[in-house]
């Protein structure tokens, strides 16, 4: 878990990028809630389940997907940055590097098809944003929001995912459990 500073967003719904399908065999790099029966790799991820949950009836193993978005590149990240030291500058150009997980490809909710398009209008009560913020927080976390839709990868990737994650569809958030196939047909736009 190391790195050079904390993060600037959560996840975004978008199309699969070039090179991603080939890398979906690495899908297991995505987070999983591990217990003793998971593979060594899953155990190494070490994402804990709160002990209080079992006593209250929640599922023990619910995978936490890592939505890997290559499109947001930091222009100036230094090792001196920390979790809470302000907002970075974003490069909105699409990166072609294929990476495990769901990557931005055919222009999703963060990378707009028209650079001059206005950001989505949201109510101030649910989402406040200072002007001129390049990477809108709501766009960045769109994959974690209710109603998020996940694009449909190639068939082998779907099979691979279904083998890894057997729990039922996750309404809206697509955070734990299988990426719902019913949600994998459309891009998520704002």
């Amino acid at each position: 878990m190391g790195g050079n500073s904390m993060a600037s967003g959560v996840g975004v719904g978008a199309g699969l990028g070039a090179g991603v399908n080939q890398r979906m065999d690495s899908y297991a790099h995505m987070n999983g809630w591990s217990n003793g029966s998971y593979s060594m790799m899953q155990d190494q991820l070490g994402y804990p389940q709160h002990p209080g949950l079992n006593a209250h009836g929640a599922a023990q193993m619910q995978p936490m997907h890592r939505y890997d978005v290559s499109a947001l590149q930091y222009n100036s990240m230094t090792s001196s940055q920390t979790y809470m030291n302000g907002s970075p500058t974003y490069s909105m150009s699409y990166s072609q590097q294929g990476t495990p997980g769901m990557a931005l490809g055919s222009m999703g909710s963060v990378v707009k098809s028209e650079a001059s398009s206005s950001p989505p209008v949201v109510t101030s009560s649910s989402h406040s944003r200072a002007p001129c913020q390049a990477g809108d927080l709501r766009d960045m976390i769109s994959m974690y929001l209710p109603g998020a839709e996940v694009p449909e990868p190639a068939a082998p990737s779907r099979l691979h995912m279904s083998q890894h994650y057997q729990s039922g569809p996750v309404p809206g958030t697509a955070i734990n459990g299988t990426l719902p196939l019913s949600h994998m047909h459309h891009h998520h736009h704002h």
């Epitope: 600037s8 975004v12 927080l137």
Partner: nanobody
Framework: EVQLVESGGGLVQPGGSLRLSCAAS?????????MGWFRQAPGKERELVAA????????YYADSVKGRFTISADNSKNTAYLQMNSLKPEDTAVYYC???????????WGQGTLVTVSS
């Protein structure tokens, strides 16, 4: 190794308040300036409750907590907070903080803190 540690959970009566804290420790950090609070109620899916970028210039709240919860961050302490007011029984859940933006996902997760709203 980055560690996120939540605190502030507990038992509270309906209508009461709690303030959750999420402290980041353990050396260097990834990415920049986003923290999220998730919750998972018994038998339900995990949901994003609130998120903040920077020290508050960009925030998000789930509809279910609008006007009741406030997310904030203290840059100097590498800590995020979730102020929860007018708590309801349906707010009962394990609350997790998340961070570690790395190429599109939250990478670092706390262990969770249990919030129980009951009379």
């Amino acid at each position: 190794e980055v560690q996120l540690v939540e605190s502030g959970g507990g038992l509270v009566q309906p209508g009461g308040s709690l303030r959750l804290s999420c402290a980041a420790s353990g050396g260097g950090f990834r990415g920049n300036a986003v923290m999220g609070w998730f919750r998972q109620a018994p038998g339900k899916e995990r949901e994003l409750v609130a998120a903040i970028r920077g020290s508050g210039e960009d925030t998000y709240y789930a509809d279910s907590v609008k006007g009741r919860f406030t997310i904030s961050a203290d840059n100097s302490k590498n800590t995020a907070y979730l102020q929860m007011n007018s708590l309801k029984p349906e707010d009962t859940a394990v609350y997790y903080c998340a961070g570690g933006w790395r190429r599109g996902y939250f990478q670092d997760w706390g262990q969770g803190t249990l919030v129980t709203v009951s009379s």
